[in-house]
C-alpha cells in the first residue's frame, strides 16, 4: 500500500537527492497523536506536523528537525540537512537568512564576499551566489570596426576587443585603449558606474501549495547583490482543478476561486482578503506556469499579537505550453524553463 506523498506535490524544503536508503521513517501512518495538543511557549507556533497528523509546537532556531518535526515557518526557519550527509534525515532549524553557499566545491558563509576568479566579485546571500562582473563589456564602435572580436591578452585578466581588418591583422578597437581596463581599473569603474542587475525570479519551489521564489538584485545603495525572496502558490494542492476543465478542452490555464480569501502563513492571517488567480492544469503532458505576474506585499497578523509582512507572487495570467513528464511538476523540464523576466516582474 502506498506510503508516499501525493504525486502532485513537493516538500517545501526537499532534502538533496542523495542516498536515502538508510534514512529512518519519521512519519508513521496511520497517524498517532497524543491525547491532547501541546501547549506551546509564547511566540512558538502551534502547527500540524510534517506528516499531516498531529498538532505540534514548531521547532525553533537550533532545534533538531525531521520530516515530521518541522521548523517554525513564521519565524523564517527551515530545516538544514547539510550536517547529516548522506542520509539527510535529521537537520537543524536555521534562519533562511543565514544559509551558506557552495561554489565549485568551496563553501562560503552567508554574507561573505569573494572573487572566484579575476573576472567576478561574488557574494553569498541566503544560499545563492550573486556575482557582479569586474570586466565591463564595453561595446566596440561598430562604424569603423566591421569584424570585432574579444581576445585574451597575456598579462591582462579581462578580454579585450580587437578589430580584424581585411588583412586579418588584429588591432585595438579604439585609439586610446578604452575597451580594455585591467581588473583594478574596472573595479573602480564598476563602483563609479554601477550596472543595475536584477535576475528573473526563480520558479516556485513547489508545484502546488506554498513555496518560495528568489532572485538576486544589486539595486540598492551599495550596488551590492542581495537575494530577495517571495512566497508563491502556483495552485492549491487541495483543489482538483482537473474537474474544472470544460468539456472538449485539454487545459485550464487560470483557476480563480469564486470567493475572496485571506492568506494564512503558519497560523497567521493576512490583514486583508484577496481573490488570487492560480495556474491551472492540463489533461495532457503540458505544464501551466505564470507568464504575467507581479509581486505584492502582504501583511500578516498572528494570534500572539505579532505581525509581519511578506512579498507574495501575484499571478495575472498563465500559459500552458511547456512539455513535462508530470503535468504538475514544473521542475521536470527546468532546463528549458523560459525566461519571462521582462513580463514577469
Amino acid at each position: 500500500t502506498a506510503l508516499s506523498p501525493a504525486p502532485t506535490t513537493m516538500d517545501f524544503t526537499p532534502a538533496p537527492l542523495e542516498d536515502t536508503s538508510s534514512r529512518p521513517q519519521f512519519c508513521k501512518w496511520p497517524c498517532e497523536c497524543p491525547p491532547s495538543p501541546p501547549r506551546c511557549p509564547l511566540g512558538v507556533s502551534l502547527i500540524t506536523d510534517g506528516c499531516e497528523c498531529c498538532k505540534m509546537c514548531a521547532q525553533q532556531l537550533g532545534d533538531n528537525c525531521t520530516e515530521a518535526a518541522i521548523c517554525d515557518p513564521h519565524r523564517g526557519l527551515y530545516c538544514d540537512y547539510s550536517g547529516d550527509r548522506p542520509r539527510y534525515a535529521i537537520g537543524v532549524c536555521a534562519q533562511v537568512v543565514g544559509v551558506g553557499c557552495v561554489l565549485d566545491g568551496v563553501r562560503y558563509n552567508n554574507g561573505q564576499s569573494f572573487q572566484p576568479n579575476c573576472k567576478y566579485n561574488c557574494t553569498c546571500i541566503d544560499g545563492a551566489v550573486g556575482c557582479t562582473p569586474l570586466c565591463l563589456r564595453v561595446r566596440p564602435p561598430r562604424l569603423w570596426c566591421p569584424h570585432p572580436r574579444r581576445v585574451s591578452i597575456p598579462g591582462h585578466c579581462c578580454e579585450q576587443w580587437v578589430c580584424e581588418d581585411d588583412a586579418k591583422r588584429p588591432r585595438k578597437t579604439a585609439p586610446r585603449d578604452t575597451g580594455a581596463f585591467d581588473a583594478v581599473g574596472e573595479v573602480e569603474a564598476w563602483h563609479r558606474n554601477c550596472i543595475a542587475y536584477t535576475s528573473p525570479w526563480s520558479p516556485c519551489s513547489t508545484s502546488c501549495g506554498l513555496g518560495v521564489s528568489t532572485r538576486i538584485s544589486n539595486v540598492n545603495a551599495q550596488c551590492w547583490p542581495e537575494q530577495e525572496s517571495r512566497l508563491c502558490n502556483l495552485r492549491p494542492c487541495d483543489v482538483d482543478i482537473h474537474t474544472l476543465i470544460k468539456a472538449g478542452k485539454k487545459c485550464l490555464a487560470v483557476y480563480q476561486p469564486e470567493a475572496s480569501m485571506n492568506f494564512t502563513l503558519a497560523g497567521c492571517i493576512s490583514t486583508r482578503s484577496y481573490q488570487p488567480k492560480y495556474c491551472g492544469v492540463c489533461m495532457d503532458n503540458r505544464c501551466c506556469i505564470p507568464y504575467k505576474s507581479k509581486t505584492i506585499d502582504v501583511s500578516f497578523q498572528c494570534p500572539d499579537g505579532l505581525g509581519f509582512s511578506r512579498q507574495v507572487l501575484w499571478i495575472n495570467a498563465c500559459f500552458c505550453n511547456l512539455s513535462c513528464r508530470n503535468p504538475n511538476d514544473i521542475f521536470a523540464d527546468l532546463e528549458s524553463y523560459p525566461d519571462f523576466s521582462e513580463i514577469a516582474n
Epitope: 508516499s4 506523498p5 496511520p30 498517532e32 497523536c33 497524543p34 499531516e52 497528523c53 501549495g209 487541495d238
Partner: antibody
C-alpha cells in the same frame, strides 16, 4: 451537525469510469484525513483509500491501486474518488468516512450514507 | 495485511441477554481497534474506539476490551435496536482491515 453526503453512484459498464463525490459539512474539513470504504452486496466492509488533510499523503488498497484516484478540494469541502477500469468486483456501496485523528488515530468516527456503484454490461 | 477474524459469524439472542463478540488479529495491533454497528441499508456507526473507549452518545451497555491480538465487544442487556451486524476495524497499519462481521439476530 457533522455530515457527509456521497453522490455520483451509477450503473456503469465494465472497463468504464466513474467519479464519486462526498460533500462535508458541520466540521473543519481541512483538519481531517478522509477515506473511502466500500461494501459489496451482502458482503463485509472494505477500506479503499485515505487522503491527508492537504492531499500530501495518500494510501490505497492493493485492489484499487493504479485504477482509483482519491482527491479532495478543501475550498469546496469535498472529497472525490475517480474510478477507472471498473470491473464487476467493484460493484458496491461506497461510503466516505472521516478519520478521527483529533486525539490519536481512532478509526472512522463519521460516515456518509453511501452511494451505489454497479458495474455490469 | 493484518487479518481480523470475528467469531461467531452469526449469533441468536434474546432481549435482555448478555452477548460477547470476539475479534482476533493476525498480529499485534496494540489498542488500535474499533467496533462498528451496521443496520440493513444504513451506514456503519462507531460504538467503541481505542479497543475500550465508548463513543459519545452510545449506550453504556456496550463495552470493549482487549489489547494486542484478542479483543471483545460485550453487550450487556440486549435491546431490540441492538439486533444488527457488528464489525471490528484495525487502524494500526495500512491497509485498514475489517473483520468479516457478526450478525446478531433475535432468537
Amino acid at each position: 451537525q457533522v455530515q457527509l453526503v456521497e453522490s455520483g453512484g451509477a450503473l456503469v459498464q465494465p472497463g468504464g469510469s466513474l467519479r464519486l463525490s462526498c460533500a462535508a459539512s458541520g466540521f473543519t474539513f481541512s483538519d481531517h484525513w478522509l477515506s473511502w470504504v466500500r461494501q459489496a452486496p451482502g458482503k463485509g466492509l472494505e477500506w479503499v483509500s485515505s487522503i491527508s488533510s492537504s492531499s500530501r499523503y495518500i494510501h490505497y488498497a492493493d485492489s484499487v491501486k493504479g485504477r482509483f484516484t482519491i482527491s479532495r478540494d478543501n475550498a469546496k469541502n469535498s472529497l472525490y474518488l475517480q474510478m477507472n477500469s471498473l470491473s464487476a468486483e467493484d460493484t458496491a456501496v461506497y461510503y466516505c468516512a472521516r478519520e478521527d485523528t483529533s486525539m490519536a488515530t481512532n478509526g472512522f468516527d463519521v460516515w456518509g450514507q453511501g452511494t451505489m456503484v454497479t458495474v455490469s454490461s | 495485511a493484518i487479518q481480523l477474524t470475528q467469531s461467531p459469524s452469526s449469533l441468536s439472542a434474546s432481549v435482555g441477554d448478555r452477548v460477547t463478540i470476539t475479534c482476533r488479529a493476525s498480529q499485534g495491533i496494540r489498542n488500535h481497534l474499533g467496533w462498528y454497528q451496521q443496520k440493513p441499508g444504513k451506514a456503519p456507526k462507531r460504538l467503541i474506539y481505542a479497543a475500550s473507549s465508548l463513543q459519545s452518545g452510545v449506550p453504556s451497555r456496550f463495552s470493549g476490551s482487549g489489547s494486542g491480538t484478542e479483543f471483545t465487544l460485550t453487550i450487556s442487556g440486549l435491546q431490540p435496536e441492538d439486533f444488527a451486524t457488528y464489525y471490528c476495524l484495525q487502524h494500526n497499519s495500512y491497509p485498514f482491515t475489517f473483520g468479516q462481521g457478526t450478525r446478531l439476530e433475535i432468537k
